[in-house]
């Protein structure tokens, strides 16, 4: 018995906007019916929650008011859309998925997108 | 699925030691980094030590005072501790993270990465 797998991409590009969104996939030993993913960020030694969500299988992903993250679900695929970054927030992001329901519990971890976030030039002045 | 249950608190007179064991079953610790976490009374849940195939790594705390190992064929992780203060009164916890290529001896022990949460055992260093 082995840790549950989770797929995520390398390496992701933020937009000009500062949005970064990637696809957290998971090989579920079992039928679950609630799930939760988070988010982790991993730079400079240090790890932060950047955002989790429970959810029931077959409903959306929920996340707080206040939370940078959004995102969908289908299936054991998760689509997870990160905004607001900035060049300060490039960082490997870690997808964890644990199956908290029914039992027995299980827990996968991805192994990090890196998350590349360059913030856009400011517009020059122009004189028209 | 991993299964983990510790054993071994109690109460114990400063300067004293206790030796905690989280033992495995349903799997083999082999892919697992261990970890030993803590919380106190009041406050949040800290990491004590972690342990995965080749490395281990301590909070600053308990340095030179605690010792992390395992036994692959028990299937189970020890926490020997020696020279027991009252500030290390709490309730202890094992839980398991799946190895990564990403962690350092510095993120190994991060509990964010973690799952499979025992229980918890009450050790209590008190004259």
């Known amino acids: 018995c082995k840790a549950m797998h989770v797929a995520q991409p390398a390496v992701v590009l933020a937009s000009s906007r500062g949005i970064a969104s990637f696809v957290c996939e998971y090989a579920s030993p079992g039928k679950a019916t609630e799930v939760r993913v988070t988010v982790l960020r991993q730079a400079d030694s240090q790890v932060t929650e950047v955002c989790a969500a429970t959810y029931m299988m077959g409903n959306e992903l929920t996340f707080l008011d206040d939370s940078i993250c959004t995102g969908t679900s289908s299936g054991n695929q998760v689509n997870l859309t990160i905004q607001g970054l900035r060049a300060m927030d490039t960082g490997l992001y870690i997808c964890k998925v644990e199956l908290m329901y029914p039992p027995p519990y299980y827990l996968g971890i991805g192994n990090g997108t890196q998350i590349y976030v360059i913030d856009p030039e400011p517009c020059p002045d122009s004189d028209f | 699925e991993v299964q983990l249950v510790e054993s071994g608190g109690g109460l114990v007179q400063p300067g004293g030691s206790l030796r905690l064991s989280c033992a495995a079953s349903?799997?083999?610790?082999?892919?697992?980094?261990i970890g030993w976490f803590r919380q106190a009374p009041g406050k949040g849940r800290e990491t004590v030590s972690c342990i995965n195939r080749s490395r281990t790594s301590y909070a600053d705390s308990v340095k030179g005072r605690f010792t992390i190992s395992r036994d692959n064929s028990k299937n189970t992780v020890y926490l020997q501790m020696n020279s027991l203060r009252a500030e290390d009164t709490a309730v202890y916890y094992c839980a398991a993270s799946p190895d990564k290529p990403f962690y350092t001896d510095q993120t190994m022990c991060n509990k964010h990465y973690y799952g499979y949460w025992t229980q918890g055992t009450q050790v209590t260093v008190s004259s």
């Open positions: 349903g799997s083999t610790l082999d892919p697992f980094v």
